[in-house]
């Protein structure tokens, strides 16, 4: 655990797993109030490596529904609309934190979990392996 | 609040903000053990919309280090290495959940926070606004 002196005014925890089990305020604060975070919504169609969104559902998790990007093509879309297979559409992946009820069905006990999601796609030059 | 009977074995919370303040196990479980999240690590250089990664550090946050993508060019890189300004490199943004110590320096009290990060860049056809 982190070596921080106990501050007065800090909640106290007698949990034997402390500091692994902590109190968390789930009234989620959004640091992005000054900008509108939903601007990138049409990139999935306008990209040279366009993607579709696929649904992943798990009722024991928050968020229960996660939409993941799947690249539409192996190659990248050229200006004329055709696909260039000399280039590759690849997913950009990012880890996100999700909450899982633990023990299951307990209304006020959760576990943080990291999952890897594909956020969108980008067009890359392929790695060419030359055979001797 | 939710009408759920108290399960035996569930942590009890006397907090006045219950259920917004809950117990969370921070022994973070990674569901992606079979995949390598570093697989996309060289895409930032090979992409037609390449990006640089900038370090954002905050000791009061978990994770304390977040890497942010910044697109290198306004346009997209062509096969010959020159930049095509008829296309746009744009950041793919994603919200991530982080934990922030609250009150500050308290080792076992946190608040969930959403922050917007740029994960990578993609090349898109620009939106052309025609003036009447």
């Amino acid at each position: 655990g982190i070596a921080i002196p106990r501050n007065s005014g800090c909640p106290n925890s007698e949990d034997k797993n402390f500091p692994r089990t902590v109190m968390v305020n789930l009234n989620i604060h959004n640091r992005n109030t000054s900008t509108n975070p939903k601007r990138s919504s049409d990139y999935y169609n306008r990209s040279t490596s366009p993607w579709n969104l696929h649904r992943n559902e798990d009722p024991e998790r928050y968020p229960s529904v996660i939409w993941e990007a799947k690249c539409r093509h192996l190659g990248c879309v050229k200006a004329d609309g055709n696909v260039d297979y000399h280039m590759n559409s690849v997913p950009i992946q990012q880890e996100i934190l999700v909450l899982r009820r633990e023990p299951r069905h307990c209304p006020n006990s959760f576990r943080l979990e990291k999952i890897l999601v594909s956020v969108g796609c980008t067009c890359v030059t392929p790695i060419v392996h030359h055979v001797a | 609040g939710i009408a759920i009977p108290r399960n035996s074995g569930c942590p009890n919370s006397e907090d006045k903000n219950f259920p917004r303040t809950v117990m969370v196990n921070l022994n973070i479980h990674n569901r992606n053990t079979s995949t390598n999240p570093k697989r996309s690590s060289d895409y930032y250089n090979r992409s037609t919309s390449p990006w640089n990664l900038h370090r954002n550090e905050d000791p009061e946050r978990y994770p304390s280090v977040i890497w942010e993508a910044k697109c290198r060019h306004l346009g997209c890189v062509k096969a010959d290495g020159n930049v095509d300004y008829h296309m746009n490199s744009v950041p793919i943004q994603q919200e991530i959940l982080v934990l922030r110590r609250e009150p500050r320096h308290c080792p076992n009290s946190f608040r969930l926070e959403k922050i917007l990060v740029s994960v990578g860049c993609t090349c898109v056809t620009p939106i052309v606004h025609h003036v009447a």
């Epitope: 789930l26 989620i28 509108n36 975070p37 939903k38 601007r39 990138s40 919504s41 049409d42 999935y44 969104l53 559902e57 798990d58 009722p59 024991e60 998790r61 928050y62 968020p63 229960s64 529904v65 996660i66 939409w67 996100i96 009820r101 209304p107 006020n108 999601v117 956020v119 969108g120 | 609040g1 939710i2 759920i4 259920p19 917004r20 809950v22 793919i92 943004q93 994603q94 919200e95 959940l97 959403k114 994960v119």
Partner: antibody
Framework: EVQLVQSGAEVKMPGSSLKISCKAS????????ISWVRQAPGQGLEWMGG????????DYAQKFQGRVTITADESTTTAYMELSGLTSDDTAVYYC???????????????????WGQGTTVTVSS | EIVLTQSPDFQSVTPKEKVTITCRAS??????LHWYQQKPDQSPKLLIK???HSVSGVPSRFSGSGSGTDFTLTINGLEAEDAGTYYC?????????FGPGTKVDIK
Amino acid sequence: EVQLVQSGAEVKMPGSSLKISCKASGGSFRGYGISWVRQAPGQGLEWMGGITPFFGWADYAQKFQGRVTITADESTTTAYMELSGLTSDDTAVYYCARDPNEFWNGYYDTHHFDYWGQGTTVTVSS
Amino acid sequence: EIVLTQSPDFQSVTPKEKVTITCRASQDIGSALHWYQQKPDQSPKLLIKYASHSVSGVPSRFSGSGSGTDFTLTINGLEAEDAGTYYCHQSDILPHTFGPGTKVDIK
């Protein structure tokens, strides 16, 4: 097939309270939000509030704050909306609607209403 | 709260005609705009989510576009069964708000 089935029509006296139920079937209950939306005769749609069963808390429109309580019972997959201090202005059709509250296109807590109950007609009259 | 305005209020249309309904938000809501159809004595039904994304089971003649403050619902080739009232809904900032509705009837 997801279904939201609401309780039957009600006639209420001014000043009384109302409690409507919304029973969900055919899909996850816990993972979704349930919102309540009302529609006065010949009028448009008005959001009253919603609950996220996963966490158990509700958000309310300021107009109804203090007068409305939304709850959910996971064991019966049923959401409830209670409205107190009824007046004739509360005469309306009340709908429950499912909110996927999903992680969409890179963002948490994105909302829309993908399934609706059949509606409960409430008449407030003396 | 965010105010949504729709135009027109009412439209009388011939079958197979193209219908365009617009929705304007009082401030930038990104793509957090959804469209619903409500037929007389029925519950609303989701048609388009997040401004332009189709919904499973909804005919392909319904499409949406726009972002920020200006949004459009298009019905390409209206059919008799499309008569009803169309509402836009923003979910960017609580409280959720709806437009006043556009009533479409068949000539």
